[in-house]
């Protein structure tokens, strides 16, 4: 099978307000060549959450824990979660194109829900 697999192992993640949320994503290959980005939501109105190559994302850090030979880790952590961060997050692989990169494959998405901060 030619297409790489984009694996978002968790369908949902629940985090208390003020904490950090880790969103997991693994891929089976770097090929086809092209960037990996994270979005909240789907379709034309989706919001870019992280692109390592360009942009400023002060609340996002990369989290690489997988050392398996057959997987590449593209997980992220978002700090200081607020209720406004709730939504479904997608890990998306793009294929390098000219002039623009082309969306190649998306993960199934991880729904982030935000619990009230413990009093």
């Amino acid at each position: 099978e030619d297409e790489l697999q984009v694996i978002q192992p968790e369908k949902s993640v629940s985090v208390a307000a003020g904490e950090s949320a880790t969103l997991r994503c693994a891929m089976t290959s770097l090929i086809p060549v092209g960037p990996i980005m994270w979005f909240r939501g789907a379709g034309a109105g989706r919001e870019l959450i992280y692109n390592q190559k360009e942009g400023h994302f002060p609340r996002v850090t990369t989290v690489s824990e997988l050392t398996k030979r057959n997987n590449l880790d593209f997980s992220i952590s978002i700090s200081n979660i607020t209720p406004a961060d709730a939504g479904t997050y997608y890990c998306v692989k793009f294929r390098k194109g000219s002039p623009d990169d082309v969306e190649f494959k998306s993960g199934a998405g991880t729904e982030l829900s935000v619990r009230a901060k413990p009093s």
């Epitope: 770097l30 092209g34 997987n71 880790d73």
Partner: antibody, heavy 118, light 112 residues
Amino acid sequence: EVQLVESGGGLVKPGGSLRLSCAASGFTFSSYVMSWVRQTPGKGLEWVATISSGGTYTYYPDSVKGRFTLSRDNAKNSLYLQMNSLRAEDTAVYYCASQLTGSEFDYWGQGTTVTVSS
Amino acid sequence: DIVLTQSPASLAVSLGERATISCRASESVDLYGTSFMHWYQQKPGQPPKLLIYRASNLESGVPDRFSGSGSRTDFTLTINPLQAEDVATYYCHQSSDELPWTFGGGTKVEIK
């Protein structure tokens, strides 16, 4: 046991063509990205070409782009490098190599020697 | 292109001692916290053999006297303790998502 066996090397005149083959066994060939890497005493190791597991996507450095064409036949567990318009600087040992994740080169063949000379 | 500079070009180390090889990239080879830098060993008349993948992961079957470290642009391969069968040339290789992929010029390790 993983085996990659290259063939098709030889002596060719500048401007000529050669077709290298790589026969794979001992692993699921159709799941692997495959590449060719060449080695010269002067330039060391140089990546030459890469093809995706299903053969849809191919990549080349500028030094061979437009002259070399990489293809594969997953039914035959075989990789092919068609080399046209050969130049003296293409003289090298050519290695077939596998890449499970399209990243590091996991396994290498023993190599086949290409000599371009008049 | 990302240029990989290996140092030293050659290294003579006593048996049982530590051998350290450096590889410096002209720009970062990190992607999402993973360093796409790899190390290979090549003995005369043989193809390269993968030792370390993604900066610090030991390939299956490779002795644990080999180790790799580093991130972004600076990487190190360490052999400790050096054994007679480790005499070879060692290469670093980057496979970041920006083509072309490139190799270092090699470091020849000999016994002092």
